[in-house]
Interface confidence: low
C-alpha cells in the first residue's frame, strides 16, 4: 500500500522534474534603456523562452528555489573610444532579493575592449561571457547590467543574451 | 497491477534518464577544412565523447528533442594581422533543420583580436567562448563556424572545442 | 516483491539524485599563492558552496563518477605590461588522477590582454572564461592554473571563480 501511495507521489515528482526550470532571453532593440537600469530582454520571439521561470522588467524571476547555472553574453563594439567613455566596461549578473534593499553582485567581468583600437576611427568588436552556479530562492530575481551600455551592440538576439537553468 | 506495469516503464525511463544526452568534441588537425564549411571535430579520442547525441560532418546531431545547453570555445592567435584578414572574427553556433533550407544563427560572437598587436610582428592570442540554452528537435544539427578560420589555433583538443548537454 | 524491493532502491537513488553534485568556489585574497601551484578558493563564505563534491588545496574533488560541466573565470588586469611578463597568459582547468603522475590539461585558453595597453601607464582589464563537459572518476581532482598569476585581479569573489555540476 505504501509503495502504491509513494508511487503516485514519485510519478508526480518525475513529471514536475520533466520541466527543469530553464530560460534563454535574447537582446532586442528595447534592451538598452539608457535609464541606468538593467538590460531588458525578449522572452518569447525567436530563440527566447521561459520554462519554469518568469520575467519582469529585465529580471529572471525564480519560482522554484535551487541551484541555477546562470549565464549572459554581451556583444560589445564601437569606433575608437567615444568621448567620456570609461576605458573599463563592466558586465555583471546581479541578484535582487526581497530580504535586502540592494542588488548583490553574483558574477562580474571587467574589460577594456576599446583599448584595442589604435586609432580613433578604428572599428572594434569584443564579447563578454559570464556563467556560474548560484543558489536562488523563490521570488529572487537576477538581472544583467552593463556599464557603459552605449557599447552593447544588438542585432538579432544571437549576440547578446541571458539565461539560466536549474542544476 | 497498474503500478507494477508503470513500474517497469519508470525504471526504463529512469535508466534512459541516466544517459542524459551530452557530448564534448575537441579540435584536431583535421578541424580546419578551408572549404568554407563548418569546423570538424574529434569525437572519440582523448577528452572527446558522445552520449545520447550523434555526429556527422562537423555537426552534433540531436536524437532526443529538448532544451540543450550548447557551447563552443575557439582559440585564436596570430602574428600581427595577416594581409587581407578582416579585422572582425565571427565565431558562431548554427542550427540546421530539415524544415528550413538555411542554417539558423543560435549564438554568435564578433571579436577584433589582432587589433591588440601594435606591430606587424607581434604575436597575439585570444579566445572566444559561447554558451546558451536552445531548443532542438530530433534530427536537428548544430555546427560551429569561424570566419576567418585561418586564425583558429589547434593543438591538443583543449583550446578549441564544442559540446552540449540536455538541461 | 521485486518491484517493492526495487522501489526502495529507486527512492534511494531519487533522493541521492536530488543532490546532483555541484559547486561554485570564489576567489579570495589567499587564492594567489605565488608558489607555482594552482589557485586556491573560498568554499563556504558568500556565494561559495560545495554540494556532493569536496575540496582540497585548490582542487575540486569528485566523490561520484560521471560527466561534469566544469567552468572557471579569471579577472585579469594590470597597468601596461610588467617587466619580464610574458605577453601570453594561460588559464586552464587541469585534472589530477591517482592513475597518472602528471596533471592532464582539460580546457585551456591563451590570451594576450596587456597588448591592449598602448602605453606603459595604461590600465587594462580582461576576462577569461572556460567551460566544458568532462568525465571524472571518484577521487579525481580538478584545479585551475593561471600563468602568469600576477595578473589575476581578485576582489570579492564575483570576478574570479571555479565551479562544476554533474550533467
Amino acid at each position: 500500500d505504501g509503495p502504491a501511495g509513494s508511487w503516485e507521489q514519485l510519478i508526480q515528482e518525475r513529471r514536475s522534474h520533466e520541466v527543469n526550470p530553464a530560460a534563454h532571453l535574447t537582446g532586442a532593440n528595447s534592451s538598452l534603456t539608457g535609464s541606468g537600469g538593467p538590460l531588458l530582454w525578449e522572452t518569447q520571439l525567436g530563440l527566447a523562452f521561459l520554462r519554469g521561470l518568469s520575467y519582469h522588467d529585465g529580471a529572471l524571476v525564480v519560482t522554484k528555489a535551487g541551484y541555477y547555472y546562470i549565464y549572459s553574453k554581451v556583444q560589445l563594439g564601437g569606433v575608437g573610444c567615444p568621448l567620456g567613455l570609461a576605458s573599463t566596461i563592466t558586465h555583471g549578473l546581479y541578484k535582487r532579493t526581497p530580504r535586502y534593499p540592494e542588488e548583490l553582485e553574483l558574477l562580474v567581468s571587467q574589460q577594456s575592449p576599446c583599448g584595442r583600437a589604435t586609432s580613433s576611427s578604428r572599428v572594434w568588436w569584443d564579447s563578454s561571457f559570464l556563467g556560474g552556479v548560484v543558489h536562488l530562492e523563490a521570488g529572487e530575481e537576477v538581472v544583467v547590467r552593463v556599464l557603459d551600455e552605449r557599447l552593447v551592440r544588438l542585432r538579432d538576439g544571437t549576440r547578446s543574451y541571458f539565461g539560466a537553468f536549474m542544476v | 497491477d497498474g503500478p507494477a506495469g508503470s513500474w517497469e516503464q519508470l525504471i526504463q525511463e529512469r535508466r534512459s534518464h541516466e544517459v542524459n544526452p551530452a557530448a564534448h568534441l575537441t579540435g584536431a588537425n583535421s578541424s580546419l577544412t578551408g572549404s568554407g564549411g563548418p569546423l570538424l571535430w574529434e569525437t572519440q579520442l582523448g577528452l572527446a565523447f558522445l552520449r545520447g547525441l550523434s555526429y556527422h560532418d562537423g555537426a552534433l546531431v540531436v536524437t532526443k528533442a529538448g532544451y540543450y545547453y550548447i557551447y563552443s570555445k575557439v582559440q585564436l592567435g596570430g602574428v600581427g594581422c595577416p594581409l587581407g584578414l578582416a579585422s572582425t572574427i565571427t565565431h558562431g553556433l548554427y542550427k540546421r533543420t530539415p524544415r528550413y533550407p538555411e542554417e539558423l544563427e543560435l549564438l554568435v560572437s564578433q571579436q577584433s583580436p589582432c587589433g591588440r598587436a601594435t606591430s606587424s610582428s607581434r604575436v597575439w592570442w585570444d579566445s572566444s567562448f559561447l554558451g546558451g540554452v536552445v531548443h532542438l528537435e530530433a534530427g536537428e544539427e548544430v555546427v560551429v563556424r569561424v570566419l576567418d578560420e585561418r586564425l583558429v589555433r589547434l593543438r591538443d583538443g583543449t583550446r578549441s572545442y564544442f559540446g552540449a548537454f540536455m538541461v | 516483491d521485486g518491484p517493492a524491493g526495487s522501489w526502495e532502491q529507486l527512492i534511494q537513488e531519487r533522493r541521492s539524485h536530488e543532490v546532483n553534485p555541484a559547486a561554485h568556489l570564489t576567489g579570495a585574497n589567499s587564492s594567489l599563492t605565488g608558489s607555482g601551484g594552482p589557485l586556491l578558493w573560498e568554499t563556504q563564505l558568500g556565494l561559495a558552496f560545495l554540494r556532493g563534491l569536496s575540496y582540497h588545496d585548490g582542487a575540486l574533488v569528485v566523490t561520484k563518477a560521471g560527466y561534469y560541466y566544469i567552468y572557471s573565470k579569471v579577472q585579469l588586469g594590470g597597468v601596461g605590461c610588467p617587466l619580464g611578463l610574458a605577453s601570453t597568459i594561460t588559464h586552464g582547468l587541469y585534472k589530477r588522477t591517482p592513475r597518472y603522475p602528471e596533471e592532464l590539461e582539460l580546457l585551456v585558453s591563451q590570451q594576450s590582454p596587456c597588448g591592449r595597453a598602448t602605453s606603459s601607464s595604461r590600465v587594462w582589464w580582461d576576462s577569461s572564461f572556460l567551460g566544458g563537459v568532462v568525465h571524472l572518476e571518484a577521487g579525481e581532482e580538478v584545479v585551475v592554473r593561471v600563468l602568469d598569476e600576477r595578473l589575476v585581479r581578485l576582489r570579492d569573489g564575483t570576478r574570479s571563480y571555479f565551479g562544476a555540476f554533474m550533467v
Epitope: S30, T33, G34, S35, G36, G37, L40, H56, D57, T90, R96, P101, E102, E103, R145, L147 | - | -
Partner: antibody, heavy 124, light 112 residues
Framework: QVQLQQSGPELVKPGASVKISCKAS????????MNWVKQSHGKSLEWIGR????????FYNQKFNNKATLTVDKSSSTAHLELLSLTSEDSAVYYC?????????????????WGQGTSVTVSS | DVVMTQTPLSLPVSLGDQASISCRSS???????????LHWYLQKPGQSPKLLIY???NRFSGVPDRFSGSGSGTDFTLKISRVEAEDLGIYFC?????????FGGGTKLEIK
C-alpha cells in the same frame, strides 16, 4: 524620514568649476538613483542626469555631457554635482532628487524626494 | 527629446473652484514594460518641487484626494476639485519614460 540636504549657495567666476553636494538620510542611499535638475531663474526644470550609487552607473542628458559630472561618496551617503567651465548661462538653482532604482510596477518611476536646492551664481 | 507642453501658462482661480491643467507630450509615454511614466509636481514660491501624482493617476503619499490625474498616450490632465490657498504655486508635468527626462514649462495657479 527621507531627507536630502544640499550644500550652500555658490558665487563663482566665469571659467571656473564648482562642486555641490547632496547628503542623503532616512533611506538606503545606494538603493536609489540620485537625479540632478537645473532651474534657471523664472524658468522650467531641466534634467541633468542621474547616478546609481550602488554601481556608479551614470546617465547624462546629452546637453550636459561636457558640463556636468556626477559622483557619489557611498561612505557618507553623499552625491556630488560638479559643473565645469562655468558661464552666466549656468547661473541657476540646482536640485538633487531621489528616484527608485528598479522602475518596478510598485515604484513611482518619478523623482519622489527633492533637496532644497543650491543656488549657483556665475559672475565676474 | 520629448517635449512636454502645458496649458494654460497661468490659471487664475477662486478658492473652492475646480482647476484643470493640461499636459501634452510630443510622443507616446507608454514604456515597454506597460507603465506610463507621466508625473505632476507642485513648486511653491521659494521651495523645491514636490511630487503630487505619479504614473498618470497615482497620488503620492500625503497628497490630498482633491488632486487627481488622468489621461493616456500623449494627453494628460491634472484636476484639483476644490482649490485651497496652500495649492497655489507652479505645477509641472514631467515624463520619465524616455531619457532624458523632461518637464513641462509650468502652469502658475494664482488667486483671481
Amino acid at each position: 524620514q527621507v531627507q536630502l540636504q544640499q550644500s550652500g549657495p555658490e558665487l563663482v567666476k566665469p571659467g571656473a568649476s564648482v562642486k555641490i553636494s547632496c547628503k542623503a538620510s532616512g533611506y538606503s542611499f545606494t538603493g536609489y538613483f540620485m537625479n540632478w535638475v537645473k532651474q534657471s531663474h523664472g524658468k522650467s526644470l531641466e534634467w541633468i542626469g542621474r547616478i546609481y550609487p550602488y554601481s556608479g552607473d551614470t546617465f547624462y542628458n546629452q546637453k550636459f555631457n561636457n558640463k556636468a559630472t556626477l559622483t557619489v561618496d557611498k561612505s557618507s551617503s553623499t552625491a556630488h554635482l560638479e559643473l565645469l567651465s562655468l558661464t552666466s548661462e549656468d547661473s541657476a538653482v540646482y536640485y538633487c532628487g531621489r528616484s527608485e532604482h528598479f522602475g518596478r510596477n510598485y515604484g513611482t518611476g518619478a523623482v519622489d524626494y527633492w533637496g532644497q536646492g543650491t543656488s549657483v551664481t556665475v559672475s565676474s | 527629446d520629448v517635449v512636454m507642453t502645458q496649458t494654460p501658462l497661468s490659471l487664475p482661480v477662486s478658492l473652492g473652484d475646480q482647476a484643470s491643467i493640461s499636459c501634452r507630450s510630443s510622443q507616446g509615454l507608454v514604456h515597454s514594460n506597460g507603465n506610463t511614466y507621466l508625473h505632476w509636481y507642485l513648486q511653491k514660491p521659494g521651495q523645491s518641487p514636490k511630487l503630487l501624482i505619479y504614473k498618470v493617476s497615482n497620488r503620492f503619499s500625503g497628497v490630498p484626494d482633491r488632486f487627481s490625474g488622468s489621461g493616456s498616450g500623449t494627453d494628460f490632465t491634472l484636476k484639483i476639485s476644490r482649490v485651497e490657498a496652500e495649492d497655489l504655486g507652479i505645477y509641472f508635468c514631467s515624463q520619465s519614460t524616455h531619457v532624458p527626462y523632461t518637464f513641462g514649462g509650468g502652469t502658475k495657479l494664482e488667486i483671481k
